[in-house]
């Protein structure tokens, strides 16, 4: 019968040829009376057999990632009779892996959006690298992820590539971060190959800022001839948030005379002071009112940022008009 062990040949051998093993008949007594032949895909071009001994050699560099298995056939013939000594036999040559491929991030570019002020541990995104080496061959394709840039705000789980928040961030201080992740094979051991990817992490706004008046005192004037509903001036607050989180509502906090009202221009986010009742210079030539401003939408969990609404004082001077 045929005698052989399983055949393995390392990929990327830089020698001219490489001895893989021996294939022989147990009837072969070593007197060169038998001739061994190799058949099948790769015979003669990738593998050869020493026809006298049955020794098999790889005669070219192999790439496991291109082809990991060769199925060949062997024959052994008695030179004297020309007859087969053994039935033709099929055998396998496996190409064994070396760590010749670096991890690659295939889904680049990565981009994620996460709310500002998110607590530590919040999941941002998962990055995944793939390695063309054999996952069943040692640690050649076992990857470890690490953070090259992004501390102290982000961390990455070494085995999963999950990026999490490790420190709260304020969008109003910085609204985006570039995080660089490295994937290393060989679980980081010597001889490891690595690949890197960049992740753009944008912070979305939350309503963590209340509107604050630009001025603590506004001076306005109104003619005593002005009809009710007249706009006598504007006041303005600023809010570091954006979008709907910066939408605000102005209102009167204090007006003993109940002469004025404030309406909000939602286009400009300005407060418009309106005359609610006609004024008479001879009766009262100046007024003092207090206005306050609040955000339009404030989720319950963010109310802590919105205690004590900002207020401003408005002094209104009534202008005299000659009367008939």
């Amino acid at each position: 019968g045929w005698v052989w062990n399983q055949f393995f040949v390392p990929e990327e051998m830089n020698t001219t040829s490489h001895h893989i093993g021996q294939l022989r008949s147990d009837l072969d007594n070593g007197n060169n009376s038998f001739q061994y032949k190799l058949l099948g895909a790769g015979a003669g071009s990738t593998f050869i057999i020493d026809e006298r001994t049955g020794d098999i050699y790889a005669i070219q560099k192999l790439d496991r990632e291109e082809r990991s298995l060769y199925i060949l056939r062997a024959q052994v013939i008695d030179i004297a009779t020309g007859r087969a000594v053994e039935p033709e036999s099929e055998f396998v040559i496996k190409v064994s892996d070396i760590n010749d491929n670096e991890p690659k991030f295939l889904d680049e570019p990565y981009e994620a959006i996460v709310p500002e002020m998110s607590p530590e541990g919040t999941l941002v995104i998962q990055v995944t690298a793939s390695d063309a080496d054999d996952p069943s061959s040692g640690n050649n394709a076992r990857l470890l992820y690490s953070l090259l840039q992004g501390q102290p705000y982000f961390s990455v789980e070494p085995t999963t590539g999950v990026i999490r928040i490790s420190s709260k961030m304020d969008r109003e201080l910085q609204d985006e971060y570039w995080v660089i992740i490295q994937a290393k094979d060989m679980i980081g051991q010597p001889g490891a190959l690595s690949g890197t990817t960049s992740v753009l992490i944008k912070l979305s706004d939350v309503n963590d800022n209340k509107p604050i008046f630009k001025e603590s005192l506004y001076r306005l004037t109104v003619s005593e001839s002005a009809p009710t509903g007249t706009s006598i001036g504007t006041i303005m607050a600023y809010d570091n948030d954006i979008g709907e989180n910066a939408e605000m509502d102005y209102s009167i906090e204090e007006d003993d005379s109940q002469t004025f009202d404030i309406i909000t221009n939602h286009e400009t986010q300005e407060g418009i002071v309106i005359l609610k009742k006609k004024v008479d210079f001879e009766h009262q030539n100046h007024y003092g009112i207090r206005a306050k401003v609040k955000n339009h939408h404030v989720p319950e969990q963010l109310m802590k940022y919105h205690t004590e609404a900002s207020t401003t004082f408005i002094k209104i001077q009534v202008e005299d008009v000659d009367e008939p």
Epitope: T15, S17, H19, G44, S45, T46, E51, R52, Y57, Q60
Partner: antibody, heavy 121, light 107 residues
Framework: EVQLLESGGGLVQPGGSLRLSCAAS????????MNWVRQAPGKGLEWVST????????YYADSVKGRFTISSDNSKSTLYLQMNSLRAADTAVYYC??????????????WGQGTTVTVSS | EIVMTQSPVTLSLSLGERATLSCRAS??????LAWFQQKPGQAPRLLIY???TRATGIPARVSGSGSGTEFTLTISSLQSEDFAVYYC?????????FGGGTKVEIK
């Protein structure tokens, strides 16, 4: 008996081309690697190129890469060396040599008598 | 590229004497070394391959030894037909490389 007979050498001007042939007999040509080796006048041996049996794999010395092409015709049991952009430094006796068996597959066990190539203006 | 260094360049010996030729590889080539003999006006002839295996028809007085980086060709008792130039050659790595040769001449 294994025999190798080179031909095609001669005098050629720099920049010119030449095609060497090596007719083989006495063995199964497609089962063996074949080589070209040269020897400049009064100098040692220099490997030029190798082709595996069947022609699947070819290898070249850096000094000839991109200028020389090795090939074979199994039906004629003949090895070729196409030499282009010839230089004075290519002047040599060119030998073809048969590869061996097994671990000596890329070796040189039988040599032809050589053909002379002279590159000169 | 593997550099093959032969020594001595010339060896002057008498008939019947022992000739010892050395060949050193710049890095390990296992046992993938061959020795060739070349006489003036002739093609090289294979003597030894696999560092120590004699080629067909080579007499027993010719022997090879060594592995890795250090190799030796020994001719135990020089005959008149042994006076020639000897080359070592590695076939472990591409490009295949030859040593510069050792000339064995009659003293």
């Amino acid at each position: 008996e294994v025999q190798l007979l080179e031909s095609g050498g001669g005098l050629v001007q720099p920049g010119g081309s030449l095609r060497l042939s090596c007719a083989a007999s006495g063995f199964t040509f497609s089962s063996y690697a074949m080589n070209w080796v040269r020897q400049a006048p009064g100098k040692g041996l220099e490997w030029v190129s190798t082709i595996s049996g069947g022609g699947a794999n070819t290898y070249y010395a850096d000094s000839v890469k991109g200028r020389f092409t090795i090939s074979s015709d199994n039906s004629k049991s003949t090895l070729y060396l196409q030499m282009n952009s010839l230089r004075a430094a290519d002047t040599a006796v060119y030998y073809c040599a048969k590869g061996g068996m097994g671990g000596y597959y890329y070796g040189m066990d039988v040599w032809g008598q050589g053909t002379t190539v002279t590159v000169s203006s | 590229e593997i550099v093959m260094t032969q020594s001595p360049v010339t060896l002057s010996l008498s008939l019947g004497e022992r000739a010892t030729l050395s060949c050193r590889a710049s890095q390990s080539i296992s046992s993938n070394l061959a020795w060739f003999q070349q006489k003036p006006g002739q093609a090289p002839r294979l003597l030894i391959y696999g560092a120590f295996t004699r080629a067909t028809g080579i007499p027993a007085r010719v022997s090879g030894s060594g592995s890795g980086t250090e190799f030796t060709l020994t001719i135990s008792s020089l005959q008149s037909e042994d006076f020639a130039v000897y080359y070592c050659q590695q076939y472990n790595y591409w490009p295949l490389t030859f040593g510069g040769g050792t000339k064995v001449e009659i003293k």
